[in-house]
């Protein structure tokens, strides 16, 4: 079973935000921090194929305004009940007899089952109250310090408009049962009679507090002399205004190549993908396009020697095995692609660095290149299905995983639609079911699954999730070479 | 003070192409949503093209799509509009329109002055 929160959130934006402007939280420790006038940055996607994700600052808008004062009340909006049911039960059952009286009979039950019920109310900045408060605050001077690093990043930068929330804390439980029964006898003799029976009952239960941020909307943050909020979104919107003047920022010898607003590792890297391609839409938005870019990227780790690859991959097992490791590699490279030189890390992630680095500490493009993409895969999945990736690559078996989901992402087209689709027993191995690997790494992904005619349920929303696996286990199987 | 000046007005046939400008001075160009109204004789002025502040996103009226692009430059504190497959009922004086696009330039809205385009055989 996925996420019973992001099932919850997801069901929850569908009923009430309509015009598609809601984010949805993706995991329950992050929902606290998505408050109005919080601060995040979105975190450019690494592929065409998965959405960028928000991340909070840990600042106020009230941090970077001076002069300093509470921020100004928000508008609590009227309250909304959701409830949401699923019952779904399968049963079958058999009898077999032979002429000679000799009877087996089997029967089998599976059945799932979750109900929410909350209460949900929204909180927002009215647009009277920005404008008051920009007009009687301005941008702190010096600048605050994690506004420098996101500038020097060119990170752009966004604010919490609106949030939905919950009233009171939910429970949220889904339940899997499974019962089976056979009996048989053989009549003769000696007369044979056997019988079995068992069950297995799955539940699953997550508290969500009280206050908690299901879904949030953001406006752009714009700094140049001073703060101002954007009011209609534009995807070519920079946070950091560039200075009027012809100034162009200098970079240390061996840096990024020269790009506007900051170096940024992913401008670098949609360079890189569309050379020599229109920039709009450089790769079509379905599975041949999803497998031209894994390629494109693939082709600069096939150019890796043994041993680097050896290394690398055994540096990144260790981060599939250990989330802040994941972390600090991420913010490392993202350190590295503005700021110069790497500072050095420890275990795991430092093993992957070390791979990435010349002596001068200085990243080398080539080989960082495929690694952001491959990180920006990864941060797009769970920890679950890091610990399987991490196990699939010690035990040299991340083809078969490959295979179901490029089979599945190839057979799901259209994407933007639900769609049931029957897997070929040759893809599952001999592991179907709930805790199988593959049934785990799919479930992950917000597919519903079944098991006794196994089938895949396709949900739209499950698109970025399954792509960026689909690029997890493509690039992490090349680096390993196994045999195709 | 503020001022944009539209250009590039002119008389052309039926299935030919016409490139617009408006240049703007006097406010912060690039906190502005941008523009193109036009108004035929004895109709009233009608939404043609509409894009925001870095240019990232666009919209047309029904009758020009596919035939129309607006685009700006903000280095140039310039707005385009490039018109292709043009027909008679294309007809029109062609306004440029500045309206802010963040909290603080949310009430401003400026007008240009007008380029008269007929098209005809």
């Known amino acids: 079973m996925g996420s019973a929160f992001e099932r919850v959130v997801r069901r929850v934006v569908q009923e009430l935000d309509h015009g598609g402007e809601f984010i949805p939280v993706t995991s329950l420790q992050s929902s606290t921090g998505f408050q109005p006038y919080c601060l995040v940055v979105r975190k450019p996607s690494s592929s065409w194929f998965w959405k960028p994700r928000y991340k909070c600052v840990n600042l106020s808008i009230k941090d970077i305004l001076e002069p300093d004062a509470a921020e100004p009340d928000v508008q609590r909006g009227r309250s909304f009940h959701f409830y949401d049911a699923m019952d779904g039960q399968i049963q079958g059952s058999v009898e077999l007899a032979a002429p000679g009286q000799a009877k087996i009979a089997g029967g089998a039950a599976v059945s799932d089952s979750s109900s929410t019920s909350m209460n949900v109310y929204s909180l927002s900045v009215d647009p009277n109250t920005w404008q008051t408060l920009l007009h009687e605050r301005h941008l702190r001077q010096p600048e605050h310090k994690v506004l420098q690093q996101l500038r020097s990043r060119g990170d752009n930068v966004y604010v919490v408009t609106e949030v939905l929330q919950t009233q009171k804390e939910v429970e949220v439980t889904r339940t899997h049962k499974r019962e089976g029964s056979g009996r048989f006898s053989l009549p003769g003799a000696t007369c044979l009679q056997g019988e079995g029976q068992g069950h297995l009952s799955q539940k699953k239960t997550v508290t969500i507090p009280s206050g908690s941020t299901l879904a949030f909307r953001v406006a752009q943050l714009v700094i140049d002399s001073d703060l101002d909020v954007l009011l209609f979104p534009d995807k070519k919107q920079r946070t950091f205004q560039p200075p009027a003047t012809g100034h162009k920022r200098s970079t240390s010898e061996g840096a990024w190549p020269q790009l506007p607003s900051g170096l940024s590792m992913m401008r670098c890297l949609h360079n890189f993908l569309t050379d020599g391609v229109p920039a709009e839409g450089a790769f079509t938005e379905d599975f041949q396009g999803l497998r031209a870019e894994v390629e494109t990227i693939s082709k600069e780790l096939e150019l890796l020697d043994r041993e680097l690859c050896q290394l690398l991959l055994e540096g990144l097992e260790g981060v599939l095995r250990d989330q802040l490791a994941l972390r600090a590699l991420e913010e490392a490279l993202e350190q590295g692609q503005s700021l110069g030189p790497v500072e050095p890390l420890d275990g795991p992630a430092g093993a992957v660095l070390e791979c990435l680095v010349l002596s001068s500490g200085m990243l080398v493009p080539e080989l960082a290149i495929p690694v952001v993409y491959l990180l920006g895969a990864l941060t797009m999945l769970s920890e679950t299905q890091h610990k399987l990736l991490a196990e699939a690559l010690e035990s040299q078996t991340l083809l078969g995983p490959l295979e179901l989901v490029g089979s599945l992402l190839e057979q799901s087209a259209p994407w933007q639609e639900r769609s049931t689709m029957s897997l070929p027993p040759g893809l599952l191995g001999n592991s179907w079911g709930e805790g199988a690997p593959a049934w785990v790494l799919l479930d992950e992904c917000g597919l519903e699954l079944g098991e006794d005619t196994p089938h895949v349920c396709w949900e739209p929303q499950a698109q970025g999730r399954m792509c960026a696996l689909y690029a997890s286990l493509a690039l992490l199987s090349g680096l390993s070479q196994e045999p195709h | 003070q503020v001022q944009l000046v539209e250009s590039g007005g002119a008389l052309v046939q039926p299935g030919g192409s016409l490139r617009l400008s408006c240049s703007a001075s006097g406010f912060t160009f690039s906190k502005y949503l941008m523009s193109w109204y036009r108004q035929a004789p004895g109709k009233e002025r009608e939404l043609v093209a509409t894009?925001?502040?870095?240019?990232?996103?666009?919209n047309y009226a029904d009758s020009v799509k596919g035939r129309f692009t607006i685009s700006r430059d903000n280095a140039k504190n310039t707005v385009y509009l490039q018109m292709n497959s043009l027909k008679p009922e294309d007809t029109a004086v062609y306004y440029c329109?500045?309206?802010?696009?963040?909290?603080?330039?949310?009430?401003?809205?400026?007008w240009g002055q007008g380029t008269q385009v007929t098209v005809s055989s």
């Open positions: 329109k500045a309206s802010g696009g963040t909290i603080r330039t949310v009430n401003e809205t400026y």
């Open positions: 894009i925001t502040t870095a240019g990232g996103n666009t």
